[in-house]
């Protein structure tokens, strides 16, 4: 802008406003997640806080276990209301395997593509929810590095329910899920005692995600 307040030249901003994020939620859908409606309740509480639309925040959901399913793409729905209806209908796909590296890698390579609605220049956020050590743990380090290289901010949530039900040590599991989270870990990693407690972290998780918009 010139001293006389005339537009000298203009470059269209990459982001129209500061509330743009592309968020992909990566859900563990293996059998040990129980009850599943605790996950859909968590999704509902988190998503209803978001201003979802093609020029605002976009949300996609991926579910994994033994394999990976794109529940819906980033550009599938254009309002919070539509996303809430769709998220409520997500069914647990089951399975005994927890292929977390595969889930994250598929989200990075596929869910965050322009073909599925990702927008150039918009901050990418991944939220990973799981309740067990991955069966493809050997791939995790590289997969996380690939996310890092593509500037994907990662929030990871460890559900301790199946460990507590079986009186098992959570130490190794927690370390693995911490390793998925972006730095600083204490702002990007959450753990909950069981599936029913997922809703207790929604407010803090939401605030931390939206802090990225600033």
């Amino acid at each position: 802008v010139s001293p006389t307040f005339q537009v000298v030249n203009s470059i269209a901003p990459v982001q129209e406003c500061s509330t743009q994020l592309d968020i992909v939620i990566v859900l563990d859908g293996s059998n040990s997640i129980y009850p599943w409606d605790s996950v859909t309740a968590f999704l509902n509480d988190l998503l209803e806080r978001m201003d979802i639309g093609p020029k605002q925040t976009q949300v996609g959901i991926v579910q994994y276990g033994e394999n990976v399913t794109h529940e819906f793409n980033l550009n599938k729905y254009s309002s919070t209301e539509e996303v809430l209806v769709a998220a409520k209908k997500i069914v647990q796909r089951g399975g005994r395997q927890t292929m977390t590296a595969l889930g994250i890698d598929t989200a990075r390579k596929e869910a965050f593509t322009e073909a599925r609605g990702a927008r150039r220049g918009v901050k990418k956020v991944m939220v990973i929810v799981t309740d067990g050590e991955s069966h493809d743990n050997h791939r995790l380090k590289q997969v996380i590095q690939d996310c890092e290289d593509e500037n994907i901010q990662r929030f990871s949530i460890a559900i301790l329910g199946s460990y507590n039900r079986g009186n098992l040590s959570t130490e190794k599991f927690v370390e693995e899920i911490k390793s998925i989270a972006s730095e600083p870990t204490e702002k990007h990693f959450f753990n909950v005692s069981d599936e029913l407690a997922l809703v207790t972290i929604v407010k803090t998780l939401g605030e931390r995600i939206f802090a990225l918009e600033a």
Epitope: S30, N31, Y34, V91, R93, G94, G95, R96, S162, G166
Partner: antibody
């Protein structure tokens, strides 16, 4: 639509063998546990055992261990309950049901969300 | 194993009335892992409630569950003609599943 379809009613003599089936559809059958439940005439429900069709991992109720065999053929999405030598006391309705939950790592939990229509077995 | 005792054995009520069914466990049911099923004559059981208080898909809101520890309740706020049936509670917190003996809700 999730469905569990069981084989038809059977009339057998004591000492005979029998295998009844439960075929799942409308969901990934290899990814959910299937349980078997007995209901003797005019009585309540008793859990017999459970199988994971994906790898045939099986757990039995202590009351039924050694009395029956639970198996599965994942290629045809079917679970089975079999007896090698039937007794009159095996006369009952047998239900299969899908477990919403898990039975891994020695800990089992979950509810049965979908049920088959039942197979009546009469031994006399 | 956990033994579940249901009471009363039979409940005689009229349509429109409130039904309260009790299920008592011989020891605490972990994580309130208790379900309720309805069974009508010549039909398979149908899931109503799980985790003590969560209604299964498609179950009308006149059915509600409550309780924790050893005492659980199924309430039918206003009985409809199709609600007359046998109701079973089931616990699943101990690596096995046990059922109560059932409560019959019959038309008075």
């Amino acid at each position: 639509e999730v469905q569990l379809v069981q084989s038809g009613a059977e009339v057998k003599k004591p000492g005979e063998s029998l295998r009844i089936s439960c075929k799942g559809s409308g969901y990934s059958v290899t990814s959910y546990w299937i349980g078997w439940v007995r209901q003797m005439p005019g009585k309540g429900l008793e859990w017999m055992g459970i199988i994971y069709p994906g790898d045939s991992d099986t757990r039995y109720s202590p009351s039924f261990q050694g009395q029956v065999t639970i198996s599965a053929d994942k290629s045809i999405s079917t679970a089975y309950l079999q007896w090698s030598s039937l007794k009159a006391s095996d006369t009952a309705m047998y239900y299969c049901a899908r477990l919403q939950g898990d039975c891994s790592g020695g800990t089992c939990y979950g509810h049965f969300d979908y049920w088959g229509q039942g197979t009546l077995v009469t031994v006399s | 194993e956990i033994v579940l005792t249901q009471s009363p054995g039979t409940l005689s009520l009229s349509p429109g009335e409130r039904a309260t069914l009790s299920c008592r466990a011989s020891q605490s049911v972990s994580s309130s892992y208790l379900a309720w099923y309805q069974q009508k004559p010549a039909q398979a059981p149908r899931l109503l409630i799980y985790v003590a208080s969560r209604r299964a898909t498609g179950i009308p809101d006149r059915f509600s569950g409550s309780g924790s520890g050893t005492d659980f309740t199924l309430t039918i706020s206003r009985l409809e003609p199709e609600d007359f049936a046998v109701y079973y509670c089931q616990q699943y917190g101990t690596s096995s599943w046990t059922f109560g003996q059932g409560t019959t809700v019959e038309i008075k």
